[in-house]
Interface confidence: low
């Protein structure tokens, strides 16, 4: 029942142009090019997009025209390979152009950079932005797509179109407002934060597909969709999983036109079949396409059917367990996952996958035993510790968060993770620990029944950021091990890491702890990052420092910054008091 089986088209580019319309076609091609060639100037990309669009129009007019029968990868790859500065800007990525499809596209994908060396996006004054928006709205919005796409090479393209629509709406409304800044800035902050979260969530989906295979993604999707649509039949969930897997495989593979087209078809299918999927879809399905797809992706879990029987009957007590398992392992395990997940919206997806894996391992062992039924009879007892581990961890960490507040909770995590994996770069440790710390404000406010899915699935997203950043420049075997051994056990793997006893402490460098008056003009967030960077460096110098020692030094540091920022001659204060602080810190830590 796949939604996506279409008749073959003579011209794929014409087909997608007609399906998506010119505006979406151009936006998606721009995103695709910016995600591949992340360093190219905006104007170069616009030129390439216009050339591709003009070509697509000739194919719409005559599908038999020259080159119209070529695949999208061939057309787009050929276009990217015309960039004159490819070798000097991208180095070995230029070698991709010597390859044939599909190897050429694979090569481009492998060169996507999760941490490109690009300047931080600085937000201009509101009046400057509004003038630019009014002067040339189209260029202004294209620039937004380009800047986000090149910094987030795995951003979910159809969702970026939704963000761009909201970005446009914010400027349309706020540039006419009496107080433009009060109207616009909170909206831009919200889009920035949601955008970062959306990018990170999609990055995990792509990592799941690319590093662990389609099977891993499908397992994740079965669990998540079964929680979300517990009234849907297994066949319906399986069909949605198949279609969703195709959509994300396409987007993660750079096939953005196909991905956006198929996502629209999937949204259409879901809305046409609401009755057999979920009672929560009505509002979503009344929205325009981009909003509809976003709304469906975020829709709350439907209520569980009231009369669900015990799982034990089919999966433990039945004498046919091994027979059913042997006949179709994947389907049987899929059904187990579906049945367990629809009964447990209170569990994280990764926990559900751990349970399914434990069940599978037990069947592998027991179905080969003399008395299979006796062997697997107690399988559900094995689940108890797996369920209790994240429950206890979340309880402890939420208590700590409530006691410390977000900033100090982040600091506790910074110390914890720096001690676990001190080889990781300081900026990565700061970024990842700050994000890990946000789990407190995000999830601890929820009631017990919603805490685990919120917390552990969010932590999976954040730890994936650590994994993809570390993969670019691997420095720690422990990080590599936790990242590559098992997708669902990443968080328990990191949680289980103790202090790295093999780490040789970094040489003390006073320069690292030399601060200047410019810290006084930073925003609160940037000032926190500066202090947290210093904290990580302290731990790297003295990994055996106690919490009390580190707290004392950080308190001294906070007092030092506050004092010097109030001084008349700030720079002199930072120079003089800074020397004292470094000496005091060295004494306190025995450096």
């Amino acid at each position: 029942r796949g939604v996506f089986r279409r008749d073959a088209h003579k011209s794929e580019v014409a087909h997608r142009f007609k399906d998506l319309g010119e505006e979406n076609f151009k936006a998606l091609v721009l995103i695709a090019f910016a995600q591949y060639l992340q360093q190219c100037p905006f104007e170069d990309h616009v030129k390439l997009v216009n050339e591709v669009t003009e070509f697509a129009k000739t194919c719409v007019a005559d599908e038999s025209a020259e080159n119209c029968d070529k695949s999208l990868h061939t057309l787009f790859g050929d276009k990217l390979c015309t960039v004159a500065t490819l070798r000097e800007t991208y180095g070995e990525m230029a070698d991709c152009c010597a390859k044939q499809e599909p190897e050429r596209n694979e090569c481009f994908l492998q060169h996507k950079d999760d941490n490109p060396n690009l300047p931080r996006l600085v937000r201009p004054e509101v009046d400057v932005m509004c003038t630019a928006f009014h002067d040339n709205e189209e260029t202004f919005l294209k620039k937004y797509l380009y800047e986000i796409a090149r910094r987030h090479p795995y951003f979910y393209a159809p969702e970026l179109l939704f963000f761009a629509k909201r970005y446009k709406a914010a400027f349309t409304e706020c540039c006419q407002a009496a107080d433009k800044a009060a109207c616009l800035l909170p909206k831009l902050d919200e889009l920035r934060d949601e955008g970062k979260a959306s990018s990170a969530k999609q990055r995990l989906k792509c990592a799941s597909l690319q590093k662990f295979g389609e099977r891993a993604f499908k397992a994740w999707a079965v669990a998540r969709l079964s929680q979300r649509f517990p009234k849907a039949e297994f066949a319906e969930v399986s069909k949605l999983v198949t279609d969703l897997t195709k959509v994300h495989t396409e987007c993660c593979h750079g096939d953005l036109l196909e991905c956006a087209d198929d996502r629209a078809d999937l949204a259409k299918y879901i809305c046409e079949n609401q009755d057999s999927i979920s009672s929560k879809l009505k509002e979503c399905c009344e929205k325009p396409l981009l909003e509809k797809s976003h709304c469906i992706a975020e829709v709350e879990n439907d209520e569980m059917p009231a009369d669900l029987p015990s799982l034990a009957a089919d999966f433990v007590e039945s004498k046919d367990v091994c027979k059913n398992y042997a006949e179709a392992k994947d389907v049987f395990l899929g059904m187990f996952l579906y049945e367990y997940a629809r009964r447990h919206p209170d569990y994280s997806v990764v926990l559900l996958l751990r349970l399914a894996k434990t069940y599978e391992t037990t069947l592998e062992k027991c179905c080969a035993a003399a008395d299979p039924h006796e062997c697997y009879a107690k399988v559900f007892d094995e689940f108890k510790p797996l369920v209790e581990e994240p429950q206890n961890l979340i309880k402890q960490n939420c208590e700590l968060f409530e006691q410390l507040g977000e900033y100090k909770f982040q600091n506790a995590l910074l110390v914890r993770y720096t001690k676990k994996v001190p080889q990781v770069s300081t900026p990565t440790l700061v970024e990842v620990s700050r994000n890990l710390g946000k789990v407190g404000s995000k999830c601890c406010k929820h009631p017990e029944a919603k805490r685990m899915p919120c917390a552990e699935d969010y932590l999976s997203v954040v730890l994936n950021q650590l994994c993809v950043l570390h993969e670019k420049t691997p420095v720690s075997d422990r990080v590599t091990k936790c990242c590559t051994e098992s997708l669902v056990n990443r968080r328990p793997c990191f949680s289980a890491l103790e202090v790295d006893e093999t780490y040789v402490p970094k040489e003390f460098n006073a320069e690292t702890f030399t601060f200047h008056a410019d810290i006084c003009t930073l925003s609160e967030k940037e000032r926190q990052i500066k202090k947290q960077t210093a904290l990580v460096e302290l731990v790297k110098h003295k990994p055996k420092a106690t919490k009390e020692q580190l707290k004392a030094v950080m308190d001294d540091f906070a007092a030092f910054v506050e004092k010097c920022c109030k001084a008349d001659d700030k720079e002199t204060c930072f120079a003089e008091e800074g020397k004292k602080l470094v000496a005091a810190s060295q004494a306190a830590l025995g450096l």
Epitope: G213, A219, D330, K481, T484, S486
Partner: nanobody
Framework: EVQLVESGGGLVQPGGSLRLSCAAS????????MAWYRQAPGKGLEFVSR???????NYPDSVKGRFTISRDNSKNTLYLQMNSLRAEDTAVYYC?????????WGQGTLVTVSS
């Protein structure tokens, strides 16, 4: 898809040794776990050993200390070194692999332990 081809089976005397190989091809980048299973005549499948991408291994008591699983990632090959073989080790040995669950299987290679 991943294709797996086992080799190295044959007839061996009790107490002897054999080394099985399993060559993997196809979408091997997604493979996280590789394992050996066996099926004795008229019996069910039995788990023999497993190795993860990171190199961690596990064995059932029946083969622990006698069998060693290893993996050469550069050659995309899985091995099973079988020492101190016994008559009850006679079986068809299957290589299996997968990202989360071992869904890809080879055709099997027959090992006969007999004097």
């Amino acid at each position: 898809e991943v294709q797996l081809v086992e080799s190295g089976g044959g007839l061996v005397q009790p107490g002897g040794s054999l080394r099985l190989s399993c060559a993997a091809s196809g979408s091997i980048e997604s493979i996280n776990r590789m394992a050996w299973y066996r099926q004795a005549p008229g019996k069910g499948l039995e788990f023999v050993s497993r190795i993860s991408k990171g190199g961690s291994t596990n064995y059932p008591d029946s083969v622990k200390g006698r069998f060693t699983i290893s993996r050469d990632n550069s050659k995309n090959t899985l091995y099973l070194q079988m020492n101190s073989l016994r008559a009850e080790d006679t079986a068809v040995y299957y290589c299996a692999a997968g990202p989360v669950w071992e869904q890809f299987w080879g055709q099997g290679t027959l090992v006969t332990v007999s004097s």
